[in-house]
Interface confidence: medium
Amino acid sequence: PEPPTACREKQYLINSQCCSLCQPGQKLVSDCTEFTETECLPCGESEFLDTWNRETHCHQHKYCDPNLGLRVQQKGTSETDTICTCEEGWHCTSEACESCVLHRSCSPGFGVKQIATGVSDTICEPCPVGFFSNVSSAFEKCHPWTSCETKDLVVQQAGTNKTDVVCGPQDRLRA
């Protein structure tokens, strides 16, 4: 019969012959012959291959370097790579999460709109009229000015986006 020029899915052509690819999690040891099947071996402890393949070496699992602020989010298997994420308080600089940067703090006058995650930075918003934030923080939202009226007091000093109002006693009219 004519030697094949193309092979089925999960096969590869070698020496005019179709051999089975190795399944994910295994590497190629030797090609098939007229008389033997493809020989594959499982990847080692810290290795993986995530596709049907004819690789003779497995890939090393990604190392989540703590010196770069990284930690393991999902441990790798023989078929999947390790997934890294950042320590709490940090976020990835790229989708591949190869290093981390510190979550930014929101300055006084700004509050946290959305707390940072492992992949996104803190989102700050200016404190609107009636709200304030007097600290630099990655956690603190804008908070409403104190309501002097509910305490039966009057506003002695107006609030700003960075300071609360100052309440004081009402002036009693003398008879």
């Epitope: 010196n67 308080g89 510190l102 946290v112 600290v135 630099s136 923080s137 956690f139 603190e140 939202k141």
Partner: nanobody, 117 residues
Framework: EVQLLESGGGLVQPGGSLRLSCAAS????????MKWVRQAPGKGLEWVSS????????YYADSVKGRFTISRDNSKNTLYLQMNSLRAEDTAVYYC??????????WGQGTLVTVSS
């Protein structure tokens, strides 16, 4: 020099409670974000809870939400973690930490919490 000293750990039965304290010095505590993290035996660090400088805004890991409460007393430069309904999986060394503008946070030496019957 930043110093953080945790206390309050110990052995407690499942369902029990503990209150951890963290005495802070060497920095302006009332202006600082603070957090608790923990490390279970043979595991990596796990964030537990964070609190804003004024103590108005608090955040919790899903694993402790509704059971743990973070608080602070800025007049005493002290951070607290009230832990209720403790489970075996809460067994860990608990650290208070001050987020830093460098790669590593400032940490205390930790206090061991063991939940066992």
């Amino acid at each position: 020099e930043v110093q953080l000293l945790e206390s309050g750990g110990g052995l407690v039965q499942p369902g029990g409670s503990l209150r951890l304290s963290c005495a802070a010095s060497g920095f302006t505590f009332p202006e600082s974000d603070m957090k608790w993290v923990r490390q279970a035996p043979g595991k990596g660090l796990e964030w537990v809870s964070s609190i804003s400088p004024n103590g108005w805004d608090t955040y919790y890991a899903d694993s402790v939400k509704g059971r743990f409460t973070i608080s602070r007393d800025n007049s005493k430069n002290t951070l607290y973690l009230q832990m209720n309904s403790l489970r075996a999986e809460d067994t860990a060394v608990y650290y208070c930490a001050k987020p830093a503008q460098v790669l590593f946070d400032y940490w205390g030496q930790g206090t061991l919490v063991t939940v066992s019957s």
